[in-house]
């Protein structure tokens, strides 16, 4: 098995994680997605789940935590609005397949958020005050209660940073986007990985 | 390695039918949505249409200028692609080509070497 | 209908100098700050070939002299420096809304 790497994302308090899971294959629209932690030593404890089976373009909101999925599109959008110095630790974004395990749709994210705020790398430096908004009518869905620490991955991304406000209502400042465009597979054997119901090792495509 | 092979092409007449295939080897086909594109000689590209896959209960898109006359269909089990075209029109006259997206809206990275097909009287 | 307008409609560059390629979108083609925008190249008796996918991805196997950028309505296609197997005909399309679109195609040659 090949070993899962990890993302460095360094941001400020206040500021917000933007990440797009990129799932593409059809089969996958309506499964129930989830956004996990992973602690050291511990199993991922999925913090927030798109309902089951997962609605189009509906958000669901857990906290600060944002889940968007366009089924249309093949897209998980994940947000952390407001982030908090305790928010850092390991993410991962996943889709169930009950009673299989989890597929993992990226390279985990090792996410560092420091105390006061200033513009990202390669951000304009203008739009430091720049307003976010969250969607107003959000649902809360129950997500399954079993882990597990194997996934299978779905393609590296490639990460940008970015700023942007998109429209909707509820106003936070002080927010920059990190948004994690992800690359698609081209390799057919790795598409054959993907796709094998059998197939459930780690597989990091490079 | 990724084929797509376009074949049922030929000479109809205007009003006349045409059915055309497209078989896929070389990655698992009930996976992806099929399309097809045409490109009438010395035009530009023209999308057809799409089929989605069993678990987007194989819905069909197509392009209004053929909308109505053709049909895209397929067989997971023959690795397969069909377009019916019915009604044949002079502007119908085009190389069509099979095309294989990388997921959900995706890029077309596969294309068949394309099949001519001629409506004349 | 998204319509897909490129410029120019043929463009003729010397050896070793820039092209452009520009494509504008009657509407918007991004999702979830994705741009659903390719663009293909196609050389006379072939089927078009893709280039860059969303926006500014290179295909596997593509020149790193090929880039792509844009987002929303706005994009363009770059050859950094045109080599003369560039000389095609390219075209971009859109695949965030059905019924997918491609632009009228740009003849590119060498002056």
């Known amino acids: 098995a090949t070993k899962l790497t990890e993302e460095k994302y360094e941001l400020k308090e206040g500021q917000t994680l933007d990440v797009k899971c990129d799932y593409t294959l059809e089969k996958f629209a309506s499964s129930q997605k989830a956004w996990q932690i992973i602690r050291d030593g511990e199993m991922p404890k999925t913090l927030a789940c798109t309902e089951r089976p997962s609605k189009n373009s509906h958000p669901v909101q857990v906290g600060r935590i944002i889940l968007e999925d366009a089924h249309d599109h093949g897209l998980l959008r994940v947000r952390m609005v407001n982030l908090q110095v305790e928010d850092s630790g390991l993410y991962q974004c996943v889709i169930y397949q009950p009673p299989k395990e989890p597929h993992m749709l990226f390279d985990r994210i090792r996410l560092v958020v420091t105390k006061g705020f200033s513009g990202t790398p390669g951000s304009n430096e203008n739009s430091t005050q720049n307003v976010y908004k969250i969607p107003p009518t959000t649902t809360k869905a129950l997500c399954p209660l079993y882990t597990s620490p194997r996934t299978v991955t779905q393609a590296p991304p490639k990460s940008t940073a970015d700023v942007s406000t998109p429209d909707s209502e509820i106003n936070l400042t002080n927010v920059t986007d990190i948004i994690r465009e992800q690359k698609l597979i081209s390799e057919e054997d790795l598409e054959q990985k993907l796709i094998s119901e059998e197939d459930l090792h780690h597989h990091h495509h490079h | 390695e990724v084929q797509l092979v376009e074949s049922g092409g030929g000479l109809v007449q205007p009003g006349g039918s045409l059915k055309l295939s497209c078989a896929a080897s070389g990655f698992t086909f009930s996976t992806y949505a099929m399309h097809w594109v045409r490109q009438a000689s010395g035009k530009g590209l023209e999308w057809v249409g799409r089929i989605r896959t069993k678990s987007s209960n194989y819905a069909t898109y197509y392009a209004a200028s053929v909308k109505g006359r053709f049909t895209i269909s397929r067989d997971d089990s023959k690795n397969t692609a069909y377009l019916q075209m019915n009604s044949l029109k002079t502007e119908d006259t085009a190389v069509y080509y099979c095309?294989?997206?990388?997921?959900?809206?995706?890029?077309?990275?596969?294309w068949g070497q394309g099949t001519l097909v001629t409506v004349s009287s | 209908d998204i319509v897909l307008t490129q410029s120019p409609d043929s463009l003729a560059v010397s050896l070793g100098e820039r092209a452009t390629i520009n494509c504008r979108a009657s509407?918007?083609?991004?999702?979830?700050?994705?741009?659903?925008l390719h663009w293909y190249q196609q050389k006379p008796g072939q089927p078009p070939k893709l280039l860059i996918y969303?926006?500014?991805n290179l295909e596997s196997g593509v020149p790193d002299r090929f880039s792509g950028s844009g987002s929303g309505t706005d994009f363009t296609l770059t050859i950094s420096s045109l080599q003369a197997e560039d000389v095609a005909v390219y075209y971009c399309?859109?695949?965030?809304?059905?019924?997918?679109?491609f632009g009228q195609g740009t003849k590119l040659e060498i002056k």
């Open positions: 399309q859109q695949s965030n809304e059905d019924p997918y679109t």
């Open positions: 095309t294989r997206d990388m997921g959900i809206r995706r890029q077309f990275a596969y």
């Open positions: 509407e918007s083609v991004d999702t979830f700050d994705y741009s659903f």
């Open positions: 969303r926006a500014s």
